[in-house]
Interface confidence: low
């Protein structure tokens, strides 16, 4: 009976071990050990038994020792096991950005690393454990399927491997690949809200408002607004899970006619997009001509009103016949037509909107100067000692400069209120004077004395 | 509007363990993770650890690793934070704050529990 | 861990002037998707911090825009155009891009 000490051993790769063959017999006629092992006989043994080395061990070998006693040849063998840690534990690239709600596939591989029973490979958040596989085929590939919410932004992910030699060498080693952090997002599949006008006028400012809710991590959101070949530059406020741009826009004449109006919200991989049509149109202000913007009173004038040619007017409140760009009346110049207003407004369609433009020009009428009995009575009766206020008012334009004298010296304080003299008493010139020449009324002043009884 | 309600103020002797709270309202409470932050006169504002509100998983400040113990009580909207085997080193104002997982700023603090410990 | 830096630790300031508190980082801030999570908080006396600017220069809604941020990689300003009383207290940067996350050590931003 031959016998082996000892009969299992778990050594590391390229590890040395000592195996002691002993035989049954005290004298055998032979004793030794087959192996393909570099092995190395440890003297002195003993007449029964011998002590080997084996070197360099690198992979799993049955050396046998074999011993022959009188009563017979016999054999046994020892299990070497053994062990060595992976080579290469690496976690596949994560997506660079994975949508919340949709599944993730954790992808590991693993090269080498023995003995294979005793390996196991785990797929980790952080220090949590998703999944625990054994490792089969070479490399050894373990995938698993994760659920990613919103939370999962920034975690890390990773994938571990165990190699569990308890109780033989009370060791549990472990190899850890480098972590792998994801970036997780949630675009909602509505699209942008485009608030703006649908109708603009070139050479002004118009604004535009592009605004998302339920966007996840809203601060990696970024928005393209875009109208036509221009490039807008908006304005971002960000809230709880959404954003807004706001953005001013003036269009030229040569953007003039339709244009597309873009908005654009990039987050992760994906793009939600708005699009909406802006027509640029170009509508000066009509136009209002006075033949003479100054005339005087009795001269005839034309009033003309010119819009664009697409444009239909009123002039003064009053439509052109038949509705169009042009419209025109003549007056003959009165005072009180001096100050008046002439309002010409013009009204365009542009893509079903109504736009309105107005223009005003005042007239000028040149008149006077005058001096009536309405304005400048031609006799007063004032009792002596009574508080009176002269009131006479001469009319023109321009406007004349007046003056009543008694005895061309003696001045009658006109709107002003004064205590009744007999000084005051007599005739008086009154003289108005304009540019345009001059008028005289006579203003008599009779002063009452009271009676005495 | 987003709020974060804390636990009121703890006096502990050494030894003994505390639990504090912070209850969420205002938003949907798993869409977020909970952040503790420690806030003492040596060492200003230290981050403990975050704990999402929707798996319940965790990652520590290595320092704070087997002194705090984070949770989280889906139903309630209210996260938890025990501290263990106090010392007077634990008397702070302890904040929860509101946050992504771990690249996220904090957008919105507790007002802040403030812990004495003291025999 | 990553240290952050601030200075200065006190900054005496006379409303409506400028202020300016820098924020050093011990490693660079620029996460691998090229965004630097770095963030400033404001806590005043007897409350909690507040978010005022997150990922660097990006205003946190209802922060008045006299509050401006810059910077990349490991050096950090936040500025404030025209300091109001309101504006007085501690302020903090924080980093996120590493774990674990690491405050400043704070500046004081009191009256002159």
């Known amino acids: 009976q031959t016998s082996v000490f000892p009969p299992e051993v778990i050594l590391p790769r390229g590890g040395s071990v000592k195996v002691n063959c002993s035989a049954s017999c005290d004298q055998p006629i032979s004793l030794g050990m087959e192996t393909p092992l570099p092995k190395k006989e440890i003297l002195p043994g003993g007449n029964n038994w011998k002590m080997y080395e084996l070197s360099n061990v690198q992979e799993d070998s049955q050396p046998m020792c074999y011993s022959n006693c009188p009563d017979g040849q016999s054999s046994a063998k020892t299990l070497l096991t053994v062990y060595w840690t992976p080579e290469r534990v690496e976690l596949a690239p994560l997506p660079p950005w994975q949508p919340v709600g949709k599944n993730l596939t954790l992808r590991c591989q693993v090269e080498g690393g023995a003995p294979r029973a005793n390996l196991t490979v785990m797929l980790l958040r952080g220090e949590k454990e998703l999944s625990r596989q054994s490792a089969v085929g070479e490399p050894a590939e373990v995938t698993t399927t994760v659920p990613v919410g919103r939370d999962d932004h920034g975690a890390n992910f990773s994938c571990r491997t165990e190699l569990d030699l308890r109780p033989y060498v009370l060791k549990l080693f472990e190899n850890t690949s480098a972590p792998h952090q994801l970036q997780t997002f949630d675009l909602p599949a509505t699209p942008p809200q485009l608030v703006s006008p649908q109708v603009l006028e070139v050479d002004t400012q118009g604004t535009v408002v592009c605004s998302l809710d339920g966007l996840f991590p809203v601060s990696e959101a970024q928005v393209s607004l875009a109208l036509g070949d221009q490039k807008l530059n908006p304005t971002i406020t960000y809230g709880n899970n959404s954003l807004s741009a706001k953005a001013s826009v003036k269009v030229t004449a040569e953007e003039e006619g339709t244009q597309q109006l873009l908005c654009g919200v990039m987050l992760g991989n994906q793009t939600q997009e708005t699009r909406q049509t802006v027509t640029i149109y170009s509508f000066p202000a009509p136009n209002v001509n006075l033949t003479k913007p100054e005339v005087s009173e009795g001269t005839e004038v034309i009033v003309e009103c010119e819009a664009h040619p697409r444009a239909k007017v009123m002039l003064n409140g009053v439509p052109a016949q038949p509705p169009g760009p042009r419209a025109q009346f003549l007056l003959k110049a009165t005072p009180e037509d001096n100050g008046r207003s002439f309002s010409c407004s013009a009204t365009l369609e542009v893509a079903g909107q109504l736009v309105h433009k107005n223009q005003t020009r005042e007239l000028r009428v040149l008149y006077g100067p005058r001096l009536d009995e309405k304005d400048c009575p031609g006799n007063w009766t004032w009792p002596e000692n009574s508080q009176q206020t002269p009131m006479c008012q001469a009319w023109g334009n321009p406007l004349p400069q007046l003056k009543c004298l008694k005895d061309g010296t003696f001045p009658l304080p006109i709107g002003q209120s004064v205590t009744v003299t007999r000084d005051l008493e007599g005739t008086y010139l009154c003289q108005a004077r304009s540019t345009r020449g001059e008028v005289t009324r006579e203003v008599t002043v009779n002063v009452l004395s009271p009676r005495y009884e | 509007q987003v709020q974060l309600q804390q636990s009121g103020p703890e006096l502990v002797r050494p030894g003994v363990s505390v639990k504090i709270s912070c209850k969420g309202s205002?938003?949907?409470?798993?869409?977020?993770?909970i952040h503790w932050v420690k806030e003492s006169h040596a060492k200003s504002l230290e981050w403990i650890g975050v704990?999402?509100?929707?798996?319940?998983?965790?990652n520590y400040n290595q320092k704070f690793k087997g002194k705090a113990t984070m949770t989280v009580d889906k139903s309630s909207n209210t996260a938890y934070l025990e501290l263990a085997r106090l010392t007077s080193e634990d008397s702070a104002i302890y904040y929860c704050?509101?946050?992504?997982?771990?690249?996220?700023?904090?957008?919105?603090w507790g007002q802040g529990t403030t812990l004495t410990v003291s025999s | 861990d990553v240290v952050m830096t601030q200075s200065p630790l006190s900054l005496p300031v006379s409303l409506g002037d400028q202020a300016s508190i820098s924020c050093r980082s011990s490693q660079s801030l620029v996460h691998s998707n090229g965004n630097n999570y770095l963030h400033w908080y404001l806590q005043k006396s007897g409350q909690a911090p507040k978010l005022l600017i997150y990922k660097v220069s990006n205003r946190f809604s209802g922060v008045p825009d006299r509050f401006s941020g810059s910077g990349s990689g490991t050096d950090f300003t936040l500025k404030i155009s025209r300091v109001e009383a309101e504006d007085l207290g501690v302020y903090f940067c924080?980093?996120?891009?590493?774990?674990?996350?690491?405050f400043g050590g704070g500046t004081k931003l009191e009256i002159k």
């Open positions: 704990i999402s509100a929707y798996s319940g998983d965790t």
């Open positions: 924080s980093q996120s891009t590493h774990v674990p996350l690491t």
């Open positions: 704050a509101r946050g992504g997982w771990l690249l996220l700023s904090f957008d919105y």
């Open positions: 205002g938003y949907t409470f798993i869409d977020y993770a």
